[in-house]
């Protein structure tokens, strides 16, 4: 079920002044599609770890990749695992915790003065191979922070939003990524009836702006259903 | 270390509109949950609504589901709450917080480790 919350294995902080318990009790928290919330009170540890579903990358923790949990599993079940260390296998970059990255299939480490070299081959190497390394998802801030030192402009190579200009987000186009506009009022977006079905998109769009949601156009009157036109309107 | 600066807070009236934002400094940021708390006086202070590190995954108290939006820009360091239809119940100090976002959950209110000073929204009938 959704309402699957996980907690650290320890208390590393004390409650902030006039901190409450933990669960915000008294407070009611509710989830939208693709949310993320707390079943009552009670928080489940990570010893008791309760995998949660995803569509993507960036719907996991940043020590976390979203993927099928067995090896050639259904691509629509997907979850939260838990990132892979140094040396460990990994098909992507995402797939390797924070300070390292996916290189030949292996998680190595992402020393700050080798990287952006390193990693600018393995893009490389993505296009002219099996596209294993690099195959669209996103890598975490520490990772991007180190590859990208000013923001992407439109057309540019990314791993994630965050390593484009504002008002750009980071979309596939093909087997890799790049920065594309953020969707104004009235563009046409994609919206995705179940999860994971945006992996099958090599022409991805980016998410509707600020203010705005992908919803169906509403003097768009088809015979079927999902042929309908959405568009990012008003709140 | 992450410091949180909150401003927009204001007087309103009932039905109005208000947003928030929560500036940060630190590069810690655009890898934090980041989460809205108020406090109304001689009341606790309570969860409203939160956004994991992407903004892929938000979350809301019931109370004010439908009426308050969570966003946040990573390149600018900012996180907003768009406040609709706000209510006298609403007034409250409003506070913006951010915790490391390591794994899917909603982030207990005790794993915040930043906070910012807080920001007074009124709101008269």
């Known amino acids: 079920t959704l309402n699957s919350v996980l907690n650290s294995n320890a208390i590393k902080n004390l409650p902030p002044p006039l901190g409450g318990a933990a669960g915000h009790p008294g407070s009611a928290v509710s989830a939208a599609p693709g949310i993320l919330y707390p079943g009552g009170n009670k928080y489940q540890t990570i010893d008791n770890y309760q995998p949660y579903p995803c569509a993507e990358d960036e719907e996991c923790g940043t020590d976390e990749y979203c993927a099928s949990p067995t090896r050639g599993g259904d691509a629509g079940v997907q979850i939260c695992l838990a990132c892979r260390k140094r040396r460990k296998r990994c098909m992507r970059h995402a797939m390797c915790c924070p300070g390292n990255y996916c290189k030949n299939g292996i998680c190595v480490s992402s020393d700050q003065n080798h990287f952006r070299g390193e990693i600018e081959e393995t893009i490389t190497e993505s296009f002219g191979n099996d596209h294993s390394t690099l195959d669209g998802y996103s890598r975490r801030t520490t990772l991007s922070s180190k590859m990208y030192h000013t923001k992407g402009q439109e057309g540019s190579v990314c791993l994630r939003s965050s390593d484009c200009a504002s008002g750009l987000c980071c979309a596939r186009h093909f087997w890799s990524k790049i920065c594309k506009p953020v969707l104004k009022e009235g563009q046409v977006c994609t919206k995705h009836r179940r999860k994971g079905s945006h992996g099958l998109e090599i022409f991805q769009r980016c998410y509707c702006g600020e203010g705005l949601s992908c919803r169906i156009q509403k003097d768009h009157h088809q015979a079927s259903n999902s042929s309908r036109l959405h568009t990012c309107q008003r709140h | 270390e992450v410091q949180l600066v909150e401003s927009g807070g204001g007087l309103v009236q009932a039905g109005g509109s208000l947003r928030l934002s929560c500036t940060a400094s630190?590069?810690?940021?655009?890898?934090?949950?980041v989460g809205w708390f108020r406090q109304a006086p001689g009341k606790e202070r309570e969860f409203v609504t939160g956004i994991n590190w992407s903004g892929a995954r938000t979350y809301y108290a019931d109370s004010v589901k439908g009426r308050f939006t969570i966003s946040r820009d990573n390149a600018k360091n900012t996180a907003h709450l768009q406040m609709n239809s706000l209510k006298r119940e609403d007034t409250a100090v409003y506070y913006c917080a951010s915790g490391r976002d390591r794994y899917a959950r909603v982030l207990p209110e005790y794993e915040y480790e930043w906070w910012g000073q807080g920001t007074q929204v009124t709101v008269s009938s």
């Open positions: 630190g590069r810690a940021f655009s890898s934090s949950v």
